[in-house]
């Protein structure tokens, strides 16, 4: 029960996280104009990974996409790549984890297969979360560097005829969304990995004795049905007592880890 809860919660947390990563990637407010120590202006500037926007005091906003690909800063390209890789890995992870959920029955899928799928999706979520956190952090570092460079220019400008004063930009809402979303995806991935341990089959060996009736060539086992731990390959509970109709290979019965005395 705890395993199912852990797996389910891990899935939900990761789902929220990946939705957040997608939202952050699409958001325009990665960097916003720093209004502190700025001249009073009727317009407000902010930029995202894909386009730049200008908002008027009236609320009217105009945005323009970055149409050039080669002219963009390498750091911006790197951040885009990290976020896209995070989304792709997260999406694949979600797809895998849906089939891995213990509460969902798909054909005769074994629990060992579900455990492997849970681990795979967990790792994917972890990497996805790390990609998002890395992408957002790289962009934040770029902003901080530019912010202090602009500040330095503000006070140590060439003075006189030439002003090198530039508008400073600070963290936009998308950065916080990205950090939180990346963290949630990471936590969800860890939960999936923990759940995987509980799903894995227990390698417990049970010694079974095969009783042979003297008069009839029938291998009899008490209970009539082959017992199963629930994790092994015998999920169909095959009946062993078959009224004597057996192949030659079945004459000698060997102990199995699923056979109980």
């Amino acid at each position: 029960m705890a395993v199912t809860a852990c797996q389910g919660l891990g899935f939900v947390v990761s789902l929220i996280g990946i939705a957040g990563i997608i939202a952050a990637t699409c958001m325009d407010q990665w960097s916003t104009q720093d209004l502190y120590n700025n001249p009073v202006t009727a317009v407000f500037n902010y930029q995202g990974l894909w386009r730049s926007c200008v908002r008027e005091s009236s609320g009217f906003t105009e945005c323009r996409g970055y149409f050039t690909l080669l002219g963009l800063p390498a750091m911006l390209q790197a951040v885009r790549a990290l976020m896209i890789v995070g989304i792709v890995l997260g999406a694949i992870g979600l797809l895998v984890s849906i089939f891995a959920l213990k509460c969902i029955r798909i054909g005769s899928m074994e629990d060992s297969a579900k455990a492997n799928m849970t681990l795979t999706s967990g790792i994917m979520f972890i990497v996805s979360g790390l990609c998002a956190i890395a992408g957002v952090s790289v962009f934040a570092n770029m902003l901080v560097t530019n912010f202090w460079m602009s500040t330095a220019n503000m006070y140590t400008g060439m003075g006189g005829m030439v002003q090198t004063v530039q508008t400073r930009y600070t963290f936009g809402a998308a950065l916080f969304v990205g950090w939180v979303a990346g963290g949630l995806t990471l936590i969800g991935g860890v939960m999936m990995c923990i759940a995987c341990r509980g799903l894995a089959p227990e390698e417990t060996n049970y010694k079974a004795v095969s009783y042979h009736a003297s008069g009839h060539s029938v291998a009899y086992k008490p209970g009539g049905f082959k017992a199963s731990t629930g994790f092994g390959s015998n999920t169909k509970n095959k009946k062993i007592y078959d009224g004597g109709a057996r192949t030659e290979d079945e004459v000698q019965s060997y102990p199995s880890k699923h056979d109980y005395v």
Partner: nanobody, 123 residues
Framework: QVQLVESGGGLVQTGGSLRLSCAAS????????MGWVRQAPGKGLEWVAG????????DYADSVKGRFTIARDNAKNTVYLQMNSLKPEDAAIYYC????????????????WGQGTQVTVSS
């Protein structure tokens, strides 16, 4: 890289009008925010006006608000500055400037500059 060429400057009486033009060489003109920046003799650069990519948002310096009008024609790759009710303090070299991502009042934000056109206002 966009190249800018200003024209339309000259001598005008106080209270008169002038229309400055700035032609851009780049076919991607519409992907730039355009601005006008001036420099009076012995003074620093002063931002005058700015206009967004499609001309939807315009911003003006308080000293020219109501007198100057900025406009653009993306089909002609040109930005204009209509100057009315000119004052002696408006006399300066007017520079056309371009910037890809932001409409700001800081001259340091503009990446591309023209050579400038002289505006003289006589009293």
């Amino acid at each position: 890289q966009v190249q800018l060429v200003e024209s339309g400057g000259g001598l005008v009486q106080t209270g008169g009008s002038l229309r400055l033009s700035c032609a851009a060489s780049d076919s991607t003109f519409s992907s730039y925010i355009m601005g006008w920046v001036r420099q009076a003799p012995g003074k620093g650069l002063e931002w005058v006006a700015g206009i967004t990519w499609s001309g939807g948002i315009k911003d003006y310096a308080d000293s020219v608000k109501g007198r100057f009008t900025i406009a653009r024609d993306n089909a002609k790759n040109t930005v204009y500055l209509q100057m009315n009710s000119l004052k002696p303090e408006d006399a300066a070299i007017y520079y056309c400037a371009a910037n890809a991502i932001q409409l700001t009042r800081r001259s340091g934000d503009y990446a591309y500059w023209g050579q400038g056109t002289q505006v003289t206002v006589s009293s």
